[in-house]
Amino acid sequence: MMTGTIETTGNISAKKGGSVILQCHLSSTMAQVTQVNWEQHDHSLLAIRNAELGWHIYPAFKDRVAPGPGLGLTLQSLTMNDTGEYFCTYHTYPDGTYRGRIFLEVLESSVAEHSARFQIP
């Protein structure tokens, strides 16, 4: 039975040209995480972290995607085209597969600064 839950960073925004960390966390289960896949909005694979084989970043994203922290993924040099959904897929034993969703909005620098100025501390 799958008792775990995936907690994600949810909906996040970041500045064009900046970087952002995509994080998922699996909780409420003792299952062993064997692999984590990170997919982009069009379901193309960005990266895989296999417990026994390590990280593999898809070559097309190599210059803009960094592994970590932890099982997360860091996207760098953000463009407006990076706006959209991102999915983490956790393969676990014995539970099976858990999936989490993050929505990233990339903002023009001036917009990001404007929205940040009015955030409640």
Epitope: L53, H56, Y58, P59, K62, T97
Partner: antibody, heavy 117, light 107 residues
């Protein structure tokens, strides 16, 4: 077009080290993908040996971990296999291959290595 | 290690026939299975990865299916260039392992 080519001695004496080079053309080994060694035994069995990543990290098959080393020379776009303490059971055709998410999309032609005194 | 059991070990067929090769895996590998073709004296060539995605340049008469522990490769309307050996390989954990192969021969 990416191409891989294995080279090295075809005959190695028992207890010595086997050293092979894979020359990669048409793609930089630091630009992504992993770079693997695989061998094909006379009995038609394929065995994955290990790989070096574009950043130089290595992962080895547990059964070979104690006697294998994979390194690279990024200036020459080469990567290397060194297998220590060989026996006749290491006689095989050795392939280098490019790996994407741990399957192999480009292979070298292979080089046959015989271990014999 | 994850064990890969391929069947049949050998198979005779004629041009135009349809054949299926199966690969049984000792534990759940989800969809992380690849298929290769190898001709005599040549290196293996990737046909399929992630169970059903055809590699670049592979004809559509090849198709992969399955999930978990049971997988198959189907070749429709066999062509003369399809004869040779076929291997499955999981791409899920260390060590990466291959099946023992299926030799497809001309009847």
């Amino acid at each position: 077009d990416v191409q891989l080519q294995e080279s090295g001695p075809g005959l190695v004496k028992p207890s010595q080290s086997l050293s092979l080079t894979c020359t990669v053309t048409g793609y930089s080994i630091t630009s992504g993908y992993d770079w693997h060694w695989i061998r094909h035994f006379p009995g038609n069995i394929l065995e994955w040996m290990g790989y070096i990543s574009d950043s130089g990290n290595t992962i080895y098959s547990p059964s070979l971990k104690s006697r294998i080393s994979i390194t690279h020379d990024t200036s020459k776009n080469h990567f290397f296999l060194k297998l220590n303490s060989v026996t006749s059971e290491d006689t095989a055709t050795y392939y280098c291959a490019r790996g994407s998410f741990w399957y192999f999309d480009v292979w070298g032609a292979g080089t046959t290595v015989t271990v014999s005194s | 290690d994850i064990q890969m059991t391929q069947s049949p070990a050998s198979l005779s067929a004629s041009v135009g026939e349809t054949v299926t090769i199966t690969c049984r895996v000792s534990e759940n590998i989800y969809s992380y299975l690849a298929w290769y073709q190898q001709k005599q004296g040549k290196s293996p060539q990737l046909l399929v990865y992630n169970t059903k995605t055809l590699a670049e340049g592979v004809p559509s008469r090849f198709s992969g299916s399955g999930s978990g522990t049971q997988f198959s490769l189907k070749i429709n309307s066999l062509q003369p260039e399809d004869f040779g050996s076929y291997y499955c390989q999981h791409h899920y954990g260390n060590p990466l392992t291959f099946g023992a192969g299926t030799k497809l021969e001309l009847k």
